[in-house]
């Protein structure tokens, strides 16, 4: 069978300051078992943007319904965008373990922030 793929269809997204940004991510399989997390940037210094289990992410909401069965849409919306939010965002699938290990990352979506329209 085909191995799970993480698809971020948008190479880039441009949002006006103060608006919300939707970052799209889908996966092609329910397995392997493990969570999806969102990061800004790559490498050891990357910033965690959303993790369903731990942390407090008041500006982030999930696009899919919280009760959707067999969900493969892990898109998120980030509210009240500011220039500080610019960067490349990665949707990352982890394989469950102790600890969870990174399995596959999407190609990334670059978020650019336009000036607030006057």
């Amino acid at each position: 069978e085909e191995e799970l793929q993480v698809i971020q269809p948008d190479k880039s997204v441009s949002v006006a300051a103060g608006e919300s940004a939707i970052l799209h991510c889908t996966v092609t399989s329910l397995i392997p078992v493990g969570p999806i997390q969102w990061f800004r940037g790559a490498g050891p210094a990357r910033e965690l943007i959303y993790n369903q289990k731990e942390g407090h992410f008041p500006r982030v909401t999930t696009v899919s319904e919280s009760t959707k069965r067999e969900n493969m849409d892990f898109s998120i919306s980030i509210s009240n965008i500011t220039p500080a939010d610019a960067g490349t965002y990665y949707c990352v699938k982890f394989r469950k373990g102790s600890p969870d290990t990174e399995f596959k990352s999407g190609a990334g979506t670059e978020l650019s922030v336009r000036a607030k329209p006057s």
């Epitope: 329910l30 397995i31 078992v33 969570p35 999806i36 369903q52 289990k53 969900n71 394989r95």
Partner: antibody, heavy 120, light 108 residues
Framework: EVQLLESGGGVVQPGGSLRLSCAAS????????MTWVRQAPGEGLEWVST??????YYADSVKGRFTISRDNSKNTLYLQMNSLRAEDTAVYYC???????????????WGLGTLVTVSS | EIVLTQSPATLSVSPGERATLSCRAS??????LAWYQQKPGQAPRLLIY???IRETGIPARFSGSGSGTEFTLTISSLQSEDFAVYYC??????????FGGGTKVEIK
């Protein structure tokens, strides 16, 4: 219609081995994680093992003795049980995993179970 | 490991009455909790997932509530086919998946 049918149970002496099978139909078997849950006589439910694709997970009580595997070409789940003990005596159920949104797994379909008795 | 404690162990109820079953988790499991029904000699059957969502085909008299560490399964008007053992299961933090010890609902 989803169907799960376990087989392979029986009576075995302590230290012996058994291989359980679970034949699945009615869904895309290769797309779902699968799980074994057991129930000792008169007792509650105990999770045993789960398999995704290559990823496998075990309860501490069976780790190193039991091996879960799957053959997607045959739509079949297996549980190889070695070094069996009296406390492994139970009905073994195979179950299909389901998920909701960003969360973990629960079990939406179960087989009828197969009884494993470990006794000398 | 997250421990689930169900109470009471046995609940004696007359047909037509309401039954309220409790499941307490040893730590926060958010809404990642399912309820199952098991009749003698049968496999468990999924009733509720995500703490409150009824599985397809489950009668409306079954309802789930709660979040965090305290959960309730309510059967609004017990029918004869509802007398069974009920188990809760958490899937927030695993392995291991853990089940409660069960509540037996018997005829009063």
């Amino acid at each position: 219609e989803v169907q799960l049918l376990e087989s392979g149970g029986g009576v075995v002496q302590p230290g012996g081995s058994l291989r359980l099978s679970c034949a699945a139909s009615g869904f895309s078997f290769s797309n779902f994680a699968m799980t074994w849950v057991r129930q000792a006589p008169g007792e509650g439910l105990e999770w045993v093992s789960t398999i995704g694709s290559g990823d496998t997970y075990y309860a501490d009580s069976v780790k190193g003795r039991f091996t879960i595997s799957r053959d997607n070409s045959k739509n079949t789940l297996y549980l190889q049980m070695n070094s069996l003990r009296a406390e492994d005596t139970a009905v073994y159920y195979c179950a299909k995993d389901s998920t909701v949104s960003w969360s973990g797994d629960f079990f939406d379909y179960w087989g009828l179970g197969t009884l494993v008795t470990v006794s000398s | 490991e997250i421990v689930l404690t169900q109470s009471p162990a046995t609940l004696s109820v007359s047909p037509g009455e309401r039954a309220t079953l409790s499941c307490r988790a040893s730590q926060n499991v958010k809404n990642d909790l399912a309820w199952y029904q098991q009749k003698p000699g049968q496999a468990p059957r999924l009733l509720i997932y995500a703490a409150r969502i009824r599985e397809t085909g489950i009668p409306a008299r079954f309802s789930g509530s709660g979040s965090g560490t305290e959960f309730t399964l309510t059967i609004s008007s017990l029918q004869s086919e509802d007398f069974a053992v009920y188990y809760c299961q958490q899937y927030y933090d695993w392995p291991p998946f853990t089940f409660g010890g069960g509540t037996k609902v018997e005829i009063k």
